[in-house]
């Protein structure tokens, strides 16, 4: 697994007298955003095929208004990188499409409108973990400058992110056939081969030979869909009593979404989920067809069968909405149990489990005693993600390796005196008590409540505990 990162450096008019006017004006201020679509480079896919390696949408750039009479400069860009997570191996050769979109913010009815300004494409060879590669491309009258790289997410390493690095099991060297992971010399390579037949879409592995399922899938090869609870909806914090998500008052009051759009709150504002045939901030844009490129984040656009459904977007995993414009925040449903950290990688949902827990959702309490030995006859007891040893008498410490003072716990009852002995401890009982721990009172008539003492020992003599 890893992340493809794209940095847009500049977008502006190409050189020469025929350079375009700014796409924004005083009457129509606008801002830019970018979309990137990635495909494996050597696949024989059609041009319109989905973004099999992933896709991403940038944030909106700053609002820009053209200064009358001034030449169009490079336009203000969104902050940050476009990041496309990939779950499987990095293919080395990949194809990209980068689109520059304009969002007009004028006073047109219903809010902003979107239009495609430029689109560039290419196929490149790129090793994961290498330096940023730069590119300059022209698209129509515009010129786009950008850099890109692919990097592996730990524990994956290598030019294809197919080798795993794991902490060493032995302090001095790695196992047979496995090399140290430069530059992490204290870690070792581990080959990553999932169980044969493990679903590439719905399964993954972090140990060779396993097949862990993404949320919503089950079965040994993660090919069986799981039905989900009807009460879960990505609206807000979970109710403590029901486990269901409870909506609260906020910016969606009065429903700002036009044309039958449904509103959902975001940390800063609201989002509209638009019916087919409409898009825009408030579902105000209509009459859209696939030619307008309405599907974001690598969504595949298919022409609709009737005028009211001009197009349908088939969204890649991790995105939803009629235009694939919304990233599914699957972590908001707190799927990781036992304190696991949730990571939404776009293509996959991962839980990083606390020590002592495992499984796709950290649902398994590890067999803490597996491979753990308690010395000197101690027995291992599981619990709470950490093992502990119940030590035989005379021994203590985490692994029962330390010789213990058997009298430290004051085992002799009723004022009996404790003596350490090579085989354990001996209690010298106070008058009137008997037993290995002086736990039994002697009857007033001299009869014992116990079976007769072994030959050679009288009641009241020290009872050696064997």
């Amino acid at each position: 697994a890893g992340v493809f990162e794209l940095q847009i450096h500049s977008f502006g008019p190409g050189p020469g007298p025929g350079a375009p006017r700014s796409p924004c004006s005083a009457r129509l201020p606008c801002r830019l955003f970018f979309r990137v679509c990635l495909k494996p480079g050597l696949s024989e896919e059609a041009a319109e095929s989905p973004c099999a390696l992933g896709a991403a949408l940038s944030a909106r750039g700053p609002v820009y208004t053209e200064q009358p009479g001034a030449p169009a400069p490079d336009l203000p860009l969104p902050d940050g990188l476009l990041q496309v997570p990939f779950r499987d191996a990095w293919p080395g050769t990949f194809s990209f499409i980068i689109e520059t979109w304009r969002e007009e913010l004028g006073d047109q009815i219903g809010g902003p409108a979107w239009s495609l300004l430029a689109r560039v494409a290419g196929r490149r060879r790129l090793a994961a973990g290498g330096p940023w590669a730069r590119d300059i491309q022209r698209a129509g009258a515009w010129e786009l400058r950008f850099s890109y790289r692919a990097r592996c997410e730990p524990p994956a390493v290598g030019t294809a992110c197919t080798r795993l690095c794991r902490p060493r099991s032995a302090p001095s060297r790695c196992g047979p056939g496995l090399r140290p992971c430069a530059p992490l010399e204290d870690e070792c390579e581990a080959p990553l081969v999932c169980r044969a037949g493990c679903s590439p879409e719905h399964g993954f592995c972090e140990q060779p030979g396993e097949c862990r399922c993404l949320e919503g899938w089950t079965g040994p090869l993660c090919t069986v869909p799981v039905s989900t609870s009807s009460c879960l909806s990505p609206r807000g914090p979970s109710s403590a009593t029901t486990g269901c998500l409870v909506p609260g008052p906020g910016p969606c009051d009065g429903n700002p979404c036009a044309n039958g759009g449904s509103c959902s709150e975001t940390p800063r504002s609201f989002e509209c989920t638009c019916p087919r045939g409409f898009y825009g901030l408030r579902c105000e844009v209509s009459g859209v067809t696939c030619a307008d490129g309405p599907c974001f984040n690598g969504g595949l656009c298919v022409g609709g069968a009737d005028p009211d459904s001009a197009y349908i977007c088939h969204c890649p995993p991790g995105f939803q909405g009629s235009n694939c414009e919304k990233r599914v925040d699957r972590c908001s449903l707190q799927p990781c149990r036992n304190g696991g950290l949730c990571l939404d990688l776009g293509h996959a949902l991962r839980c990083r489990c606390r020590a002592g827990f495992a499984g796709p959702r950290c649902e398994h309490d590890l067999d803490d005693c597996a491979g753990r030995a308690c010395a000197n006859g101690g027995t291992c007891v599981e619990g709470g993600g950490a093992h502990r040893c119940s030590c035989a008498l005379g021994f203590g410490g985490r692994d029962c390796r330390e010789r213990a003072d058997p009298c430290a716990a004051r085992p002799c009852a009723h004022g009996g005196r404790c003596y350490a002995h090579f085989s354990g401890l001996v209690c010298a009982c106070a008058p009137g008590y008997m037993g290995a721990r002086c736990e039994f009172p002697v009857h007033p008539d001299g009869a014992s409540a116990l079976p007769a003492a072994p030959p050679g020992l009288r009641p009241g003599d020290p009872q050696r505990y064997l």
Epitope: V120, G122, R124, A139
Partner: antibody
Framework: QVQLVQSGAEVKKPGASVKVSCKAS????????IHWIRQAPGQGLEWMGY????????EFNQNFKDRVTMTRDTSTSTVYMELSSLRSEDTAVYYC??????????WGQGTTVTVSS | AIQLTQSPSSLSASVGDRVTITCRAS??????LAWYQQKPGKAPKLLIY???SLEDGVPSRFSGSGSGTDFTLTISSLQPEDFATYFC?????????FGGGTKLEIK
């Protein structure tokens, strides 16, 4: 206006090296890449590689990878292309061109390199 | 490397004619195709980039079209200065590659 001016014609013996220069003017030198393209007599065009004058990053056609070197001097806005281990089939006109990855918008006038024993 | 096949390899036409030259790529190159004009003893000159974008200063009688694998350069009304050799070039993959050229001659 944008201009790329190349060095003069060269005659070389097989096994020798040739170094061709390309001096840029009329634009910000480090803003665009400089590509090298060659054309054998009566033949088509063959891309050799490019240099990014900002980073000095180079990328070459595999056909030339082991024999070509590209360098630049920002103080004079000049790019150099050196081709070693010359063979008779390297006889061609060598062009430099300004551009990005999908356009070569201005070309030098060409430098004729003749390889003959 | 991606191969580009130009046709025809040579063409005779008269001033005022409408001329079409085609370029076919060995695989999908989207719209990453440029057209260059070269006159004898001169360097090539960029006419069209990204399949249909006219370079600054190039007369509007030149136009480009196509995407994917099939592309066309059209000269709507030939002028005397248009007689030259025309090359297509793909810029989708590295290395960029050129077509074999179409020599446009006066009939």
């Amino acid at each position: 206006q944008v201009q790329l001016v190349q060095s003069g014609a060269e005659v070389k013996k097989p096994g020798a090296s040739v170094k061709v220069s390309c001096k840029a003017s009329g634009y910000h030198f480090t803003r665009y890449w400089i590509h090298w393209i060659r054309q054998a007599p009566g033949q088509g065009l063959e891309w050799m590689g490019y240099i990014n004058p900002t980073t000095v990053y180079t990328e070459f056609n595999q056909n030339f990878k082991d024999r070509v070197t590209m360098t630049r001097d920002t103080s004079t806005s000049t790019v150099y292309m050196e081709l070693s281990s010359l063979r008779s089939e390297d006889t061609a006109v060598y062009y430099c061109a300004r551009g990005g990855s999908n356009f070569f918008d201005y070309w030098g006038q060409g430098t004729t390199v003749t390889v003959s024993s | 490397a991606i191969q580009l096949t130009q046709s025809p390899s040579s063409l005779s036409a008269s001033v005022g004619d409408r001329v079409t030259i085609t370029c076919r790529a060995s695989e999908n190159i989207y719209y990453n195709l440029a057209w260059y004009q070269q006159k004898p003893g001169k360097a090539p000159k960029l006419l069209i980039y990204t399949a249909n974008s006219l370079e600054d200063g190039v007369p509007s009688r030149f136009s480009g079209s196509g995407s994917g694998t099939d592309f066309t350069l059209t000269i709507s009304s030939l002028q005397p200065e248009d007689f030259a050799t025309y090359f297509c070039k793909q810029a989708y993959d590295v290395p960029p590659t050129f077509g074999g050229g179409t020599k446009l001659e006066i009939k």
